[in-house]
Interface confidence: medium
């Protein structure tokens, strides 16, 4: 808390400029008008204020806007955003994607902080759903963002947003999350032709049911082994040897090395030995 002291004569700030870096903390408090600061927030980032000076500026804004900052100020916070607490951010109403981008840019290259997580939560709740543009923005800054959401939160993702998802965005998703995302992806890509469809749906197949895998096996897709290893065990178990052979195409050779790993191990145990022998891989059920 900074003590209230009168501003020395001639030091009253007329605008936010470089001269303020020479002000002591108490001088900033006394000589910078909070309303002036709010209207010239965009200038703060160009001035090399110390962390302590930024604390004073934040304090002034907090006093001016006890109920939370308006978006016109939030959009220009820049490095002052790093001074905000999740409690501060919970008071905000952020509706503009430009504001979100501006603040994510400040945190770029760092792990997702509690502040950023709170900001995103406020933004998404304000919009009511994770639309494509938002998802595009969030996954560009945080590739793992999608997989940080609960299955319940993912259920609010509209199928149209799935077009923004890149394979690496799903790297850390668990089966429960893919169970939610897969039907949306299937809907989003339903009008694509066979090979194009497979390229798009491939990353989501960890949520695919048996009937969809059977359908894919009829389409000459040559699923790669890395994708096969991520399929749900319960979806793989009912597949016949012939279906798995069609599904994997030339990649079926890789099954031998994975015979001790799920889902291959459990699938092998469900097959007749005569059928396994047709693969010529020496798999033992």
């Amino acid at each position: 808390e900074v003590e209230k002291t009168a501003c020395p004569s001639g030091k009253k700030a007329r605008e936010i400029d470089e001269s303020l870096i020479f002000y002591k903390k108490w001088e900033l408090e006394a000589c910078v008008d909070a309303a002036l600061l709010a209207t010239q927030m965009d200038r703060v980032n160009a001035i090399p204020f110390t962390y302590e000076q930024l604390d004073v500026l934040k304090h002034k804004l907090d006093e001016l806007y006890p109920q939370g900052y308006p978006e016109s100020v939030i959009q220009h916070l820049g490095y002052l955003f790093l001074k905000m607490s999740p409690e501060d951010i919970r008071k905000w109403n952020v509706t503009s994607l430009e504001t979100l981008k501006a603040l994510l840019e400040v945190n770029k290259g760092h792990e997702m902080s509690p502040q950023v997580a709170t900001l995103i939560d406020r933004f998404v709740k304000g919009r009511g759903q994770l639309d494509k543009d938002t998802l595009d923005t969030l996954t560009a800054f945080y590739p793992g963002y999608l997989c940080s959401l609960s299955p319940e939160e993912l259920s609010s993702v509209p199928p149209s947003s799935i077009w923004a998802v890149r394979p690496q965005d799903l790297d850390t998703c668990d089966p429960r999350q893919l169970d939610v995302l897969y039907p949306k992806a299937r809907l989003a890509f339903q009008n694509m032709n066979g090979s194009e469809y497979f390229v798009k749906i491939q990353s989501f197949l960890g949520g695919a049911p048996t009937e969809d895998l059977k359908a894919l096996s009829q389409q000459n897709v040559s699923m790669d082994l890395a994708t096969f290893m991520k399929l749900r065990t319960d979806a793989v178990l009912p597949l016949t040897v012939a279906e798995v052979q069609k599904l994997l195409g030339p990649h079926v050779e890789g099954l031998k090395a994975e015979e001790r790993h799920r889902p291959v191990r459990d699938w092998i145990l469900r097959q007749r030995q005569d059928d396994l022998d047709t693969l010529g891989l020496g798999l033992q059920g």
């Epitope: 082994l225 990649h251 890789g254 994975e258």
Partner: nanobody, 124 residues
Amino acid sequence: EVQLVESGGGSVQAGGSLTLSCAASESRDCMAWFRQAPGKAREGVASIYAPDGSTTYADTVKGRFTISQDNAKNTLYLQMNSLQPEDAAMYHCAIGGLSRNTCGYLRGGYFAYFGRGTQVTVSS
């Protein structure tokens, strides 16, 4: 689940060198390096077949990159010399239980596991 963790990426000037490492939680007969630049398809770089140590290289890296492994440590390496801007990409290691021939095809579809990758940046 098999874990693959790459390291050693970074920024380097054209003509410089880097050595990438990949620590694997389990071994397989075939280990390889793949790379993917933004907006481009994944491309095979080099592979090594553990039982006899035979190696395969993509034409674009022959004579500049060397793949090797330490079987005792389940670690794969990629020594990259004379790096060029076009070598900049995310480098992923991959393992699979493949035959000698298939290992040499350098096709991603045959591999069961891929690591998350390590970024290599080359400035001219």
